[in-house]
Amino acid sequence: SIPWNLERIIPAWHQTEEDRSPDGSSQVEVYLLDTSIQGAHREIEGRVTITDFNSVPEEDGTRFHRQASKCDSHGTHLAGVVSGRDAGVAKGTSLHSLRVLNCQGKGTVSGTLIGLEFIRKSQLIQPSGPLVVLLPLAGGYSRILNAACRHLARTGVVLVAAAGNFRDDACLYSPASAPEVITVGATNAQDQPVTLGTLGTNFGRCVDLFAPGKDIIGASSDCSTCFMSQSGTSQAAAHVAGIVARMLSREPTLTLAELRQRLIHFSTKDVINMAWFPEDQQVLTPNLVATLPPSTHETGGQLLCRTVWSAHSGPTRTATATARCAPEEELLSCSSFSRSGRRRGDWIEAIGGQQVCKALNAFGGEGVYAVARCCLVPRANCSIHNTPAARAGLETHVHCHQKDHVLTGCSFHWEVEDLSVRRQPALRSRRQPGQCVGHQAASVYASCCHAPGLECKIKEHGISGPSEQVTVACEAGWTLTGCNVLPGASLTLGAYSVDNLCVARVHDTARADRTSGEATVAAAICCRSRPSAKASWVQHHHHHH
Amino acid sequence: QDEDGDYEELMLALPSQEDGLADEAAHVATATFRRCSKEAWRLPGTYIVVLMEETQRLQIEQTAHRLQTRAARRGYVIKVLHIFYDLFPGFLVKMSSDLLGLALKLPHVEYIEEDSFVFAQ
């Protein structure tokens, strides 16, 4: 007897299970930055501390009438979604409310910053258990709001934010665009993106995942026993904040990077109809609906990876795009993608002590994306091996020459602008296992890692006939770490990873010109982490149609 | 995101107005002014002055005080509404936009962001 949204995010085996904190561990605390709330509501009574924090702008209009039930509506509902007894995700969680939104649901960047600072001060004065901060609000892109979120996240606080209800790119809004924040879009009971009047959920590369956000039943501030449904990315974010609270109550030492990776890994995949999003955003938007993951005790030892897209480089001739992993993650591979196919490849370089994935636009190109594969590899030692471009049409190759290091990804970067002279590079494992091979005028980069029990293999899939894309998936138990396109006769747009699927994209116009003998190949590097085993290279599998 | 998307960044390296302060005249503004790309969401007159990451507590207060002093010399009253110590060094100030050029030239200033609205989602 549970509402659709809870049924969707809490798998059957979790529904009766209580997430109790281990003995002696501190309780998870959720901080809600929103409107005022009705703390006496039956759903949340005894679970909520209404702090004395209040930093809101004046309401608009001279005749505005402050009605408590209206002032409390948004915050009360969200508090109920997080920790409500009947309709909450994390029923036992204690919640602290900070008022940063006025009775009209309006706040300021400065008020939100002061609220975040209040949380930091509370943390310094009285260190407690894990903290989750729910930010069910959005404004225009703000460098300082994003920076404040970054600073707070680096103290171990987990921030969850609404993607925004503007049917727009979430990267244009804050705190949704802050990389350190878990940004949540909204889906409905049919797992489709939420429409809200003429607008709807935000989307794009700054969204980490989606969660229920349409017709969500929760506490209503009309009375202490009233319930109502509300819709929006706030409700979606509240679901994820509740999931995170439950994860942390079971395992208080989980880090932000682990939480995000587990949320992504255990989410329901490929149920969202991507056609709802603008065409240029479809590839950037995650097709993921949140579910409560099992504990690491039940699923330990898995290699977890996610795909991080850069911002678009822009069309200038030397425009570059940069994709970064979180500090705790390893950058296991870097690829690039351009809608026009005019790109000069990708590479990994160190900036400020951190490896980043870079992609370069080509003359006449409309711009590129850098696509990083970011993974959690315990006790990893990773390095990049680079071979500069060879002269006179010779191929360039590079392999992992350090003992016990395995190849996790290849990158290729062309020195020349002329797309006609180059044959795009290849990852030719048939010649030598664990080797990246490029053709003339290409610099080749191999990502090599050593970690206990890490083993990898290459899996290829080629299609000779006309096709806009070629895909290859890693089988169950293996995780995709690298994805490249090995071209046939046609111009390739690039390659990227979608969950465990390597997607190689081919230029539409080239399809008619194809000769059947020249297959375009998607090449995936699939890795797994076997506990208490040596790192090893497994001979690849390839298969062509 | 790393790049500042749909976001206004304005370089206000305005010529120093003489007020007899050598250090002010010598300090060229490398700091930037930022504001929300959506005009209706802007709150002109309230600014978040963000200082360099390593700025010490005392320097934050000194910078805010220095801005007040220099503004007063020009006949402007400014109000420091909040000082940020714990998450980032900076302060929130209510002042005329006429003073932005002056504020950007203060030592330790990394950028100034005009306050803007956020909304329940």
């Epitope: 005894g46 007894r85 209503s220 026993t225 009233c226 319930f227 | -």
Partner: antibody, heavy 117, light 107 residues
């Protein structure tokens, strides 16, 4: 499966006392408000009392406040209704119910209490 | 106490018909209203809570609407198994109070 089982009622003299109990199973008892509702044969439903999660807060029908006490034992998953100074108008079928979304979503099978000399 | 009034003690209908039962509160109860079905010899069964939310497992021919003081419970196409007594109940403020009930019968 959620189950609420009321204890046997019975015939009692006017002025006497009786304690009803309701044993809950199939859900986390301490997570729910619980209530008693009664129904006079061939008549409508009348709410009697409810109790919050930990027993620290109770509400009653005004006319019954002085004679009826609702309580709970979360360790044993049992809800009680202590009735004293019983009157003939207390004759009814007594239902124990679980409250969810402030409505009563699960009901026991009911137990018949007859107050008569 | 809030008084709940179901103006019709009985309502006659035919199978397949649409039928609506009304309930009026003596004061504003927002949307804090539930509807129950009781068949002879059985305990009441929750159908609708918070005026318009169908409880889990309840067929979608049952709907509720209204807020404030006036509420309606509708069965879009009456089935044989729907013949029962229907009660409204406010959960806005204690003591919770029920309407007198409306018995649905076949013409």
């Amino acid at each position: 499966e959620v189950k609420l089982v009321e204890s046997e009622g019975g015939l009692v003299q006017p002025g006497s006392s009786m304690k009803l109990s309701c044993t809950a199973s199939g859900f986390t008892f301490s997570d729910y408000y619980m209530a008693w509702v009664r129904q006079v044969p061939e008549k409508g439903l009348e709410w009697v009392a409810n109790i919050n999660y930990d027993g620290s807060n109770t509400s009653y029908l005004d006319s019954l406040k002085s004679r009826f006490i609702i309580s709970r034992d979360n360790a044993k998953n049992i809800l009680y209704l202590q009735m004293s100074s019983l009157k003939s108008e207390d004759t009814a079928t007594y239902y124990c119910a679980r409250e969810k979304f402030a409505a009563m979503d699960y009901w026991g099978q009911g137990t018949s209490v007859t107050v008569s000399s | 106490d809030i008084v709940m009034t179901q103006s019709h003690k009985f309502m006659s209908t035919s199978f397949g018909d649409r039928v609506s039962i009304t309930c009026k509160a003596s004061q504003d109860v927002s949307n804090a209203l539930a509807w129950y079905q009781q068949k002879p010899g059985h305990s009441p069964k929750l159908l609708i809570f918070s005026a318009s939310y169908r409880y889990t497992g309840v067929p979608d021919r049952f709907t509720g609407s209204g807020s404030g003081t006036d509420f309606t419970f509708t069965i879009s196409s009456v089935q044989a198994e729907d013949l029962a007594v229907y009660y409204c109940q406010q959960h806005y403020s204690t003591p919770w109070t029920f309407g007198g009930g409306t018995k649905l019968e076949i013409k």
